[in-house]
Amino acid sequence: SSPTSSASSFSSSAPFLASAVSAQPPLPDQCPALCECSEAARTVKCVNRNLTEVPTDLPAYVRNLFLTGNQLAVLPAGAFARRPPLAELAALNLSGSRLDEVRAGAFEHLPSLRQLDLSHNPLADLSPFAFSGSNASVSAPSPLVELILNHIVPPEDERQNRSFEGMVVAALLAGRALQGLRRLELASNHFLYLPRDVLAQLPSLRHLDLSNNSLVSLTYVSFRNLTHLESLHLEDNALKVLHNGTLAELQGLPHIRVFLDNNPWVCDCHMADMVTWLKETEVVQGKDRLTCAYPEKMRNRVLLELNSADLDCDPILPPSLQTS
């Protein structure tokens, strides 16, 4: 077998060895074909190699596994199950590997897996039990503390008939396995709404990134239980206004920093409460950059510079007085 390197340098396996060893149990110092390994760094990199499946002969010492830029397509159940198990694997990056299906139990038998990155994969079919591993109403707790799911929305023509938001949330909530999750990134997924129950069931969250989606309103979302939340990224959405209930919940979180840049704020009479809040709150980061998008006469006005006289609503005429 090809020796793994010492110190920090990486060794590469010769491709022709792959078939010769695939049926054998991996040797302690083995590095899979098309991968680079560093035992000193406990790291294996199989990057941009057009792999179509997860290598079977991963070294038992692996703590950080990069499988980015491949063509994996499907992640089956037990995709990383090995004998002996990959007991040290803590960080797994599968971003940009053309995954369109992640099956139930895909990450089973990884007892130390703390960070998982599935970003930039068109996940048309994410099993509800991808992270929980079983369909029990309460599963064994997942060790995951960081789950990165940025830009996993498939092209519209490849989506199932169900709601994409619903599919993702089902996977996050199944079996309450992710109760220990501290970081969740869901940026760039075209989310139109955030299902109301999702945050209540992720009580350990410290960092939530919902930036670059299409969220129009947070009216039915509750942040009240997220008492550990430190950062909430809502930049680049379609938010028009935040209402009093949301403002009060955010204001009450003891560690929170909120990011609201680049939303199309509607500066009419409904914005008055939010403007009042913004002028006094310290939790919004870069609040001096927030500007109105509508109505046209208010475009580019800075929210912090508005007063109540600026924030009016056109009167709604009774039907008998409306003209066509």
């Epitope: 403002l247 009060a248 204001q251 009450g252 560690h255 920093r257 709150t281 310290e282 939790v283």
Partner: antibody
């Protein structure tokens, strides 16, 4: 583990200047508001001012009693907070504490240093 | 500025008994549903230590005999069963408005 260590205190004459430093460790310094609070011998606590975090442009707020004389600044590359004190008066004699605000600064200070004593006397 | 008035100035309580300290603000310290009122404990030669934030939230690591209550302008710190290590000066502080202000302190002693 969050740690705040003040230095730079000492004896200075009225009208003189002094610069206090606070070395921070154990947290992402740029994410947090930082403040100075002082305590005259045998007296209560007095808020001196704070400096905001990166997200809010590192702007400052000072109490009226030190405005125009004291300046709060920070060097994020060194995770350090500073208090430049000019035109010192005898009533500025106090232990000066560096403190970190919570992530939500409305909940005030959760970690404090041990303090450094400034004595203004002729 | 918001003025905080603490009472009493000092308090002598028997070990195991309840100690109650009050703090009154000259105007409401509530903002969008939360009262931004903290309680600190200070022992001689030490910096203040945060006990309670947001009027009633007990800081991590603080014994559960400490509790805070109140809203708007009137607040209370309660030590349900005084221990020897609780002998200290207690300060309330508002962070609703700049400048942040502190109460004058209450010295708790053993009777």
């Amino acid at each position: 583990e969050v740690q705040l260590v003040e230095s730079g205190g000492g004896l200075v004459q009225p009208g003189g200047s002094l610069r206090l430093s606070c070395a921070a460790s154990g947290f992402t310094f740029t994410d947090y508001y930082m403040s100075w609070v002082r305590q005259a011998p045998g007296k209560g606590l007095e808020w001196v001012g704070f400096i905001r975090n990166k997200g809010n442009g590192y702007t400052t707020e000072n109490s009226a009693s030190v405005k125009g004389r004291f300046t709060i600044s920070r060097d994020n590359s060194k995770s350090s907070l500073y208090l430049q004190m000019n035109s010192l008066k005898t009533e500025d004699t106090a232990v000066y504490y560096c403190a970190r605000y919570r992530g939500n600064p409305h909940y005030a200070m959760d970690y404090w240093g041990q303090g450094t004593l400034v004595t203004v006397s002729s | 500025d918001i003025v905080l008035t603490q009472s009493p100035d000092s308090l002598a309580v028997s070990l195991g008994e309840r100690a109650t300290i009050n703090c009154r603000a000259s105007e409401s310290v509530e903002f969008y549903g939360t009262s931004f009122l903290q309680w600190y404990q200070q022992k001689p030669g030490q910096p203040p230590k945060l006990l309670i934030y947001g009027a009633s939230n007990v800081e991590s690591g603080v014994p559960d005999r400490f509790s805070g209550s109140g809203s708007g302008t009137d607040f209370t710190l309660t030590i349900s069963s005084l221990q020897a290590e609780d002998i200290a000066v207690y300060f309330c502080q508002q962070s609703r408005k700049v400048p942040s202000t502190f109460g004058g302190g209450t010295k708790v002693e053993i009777k």
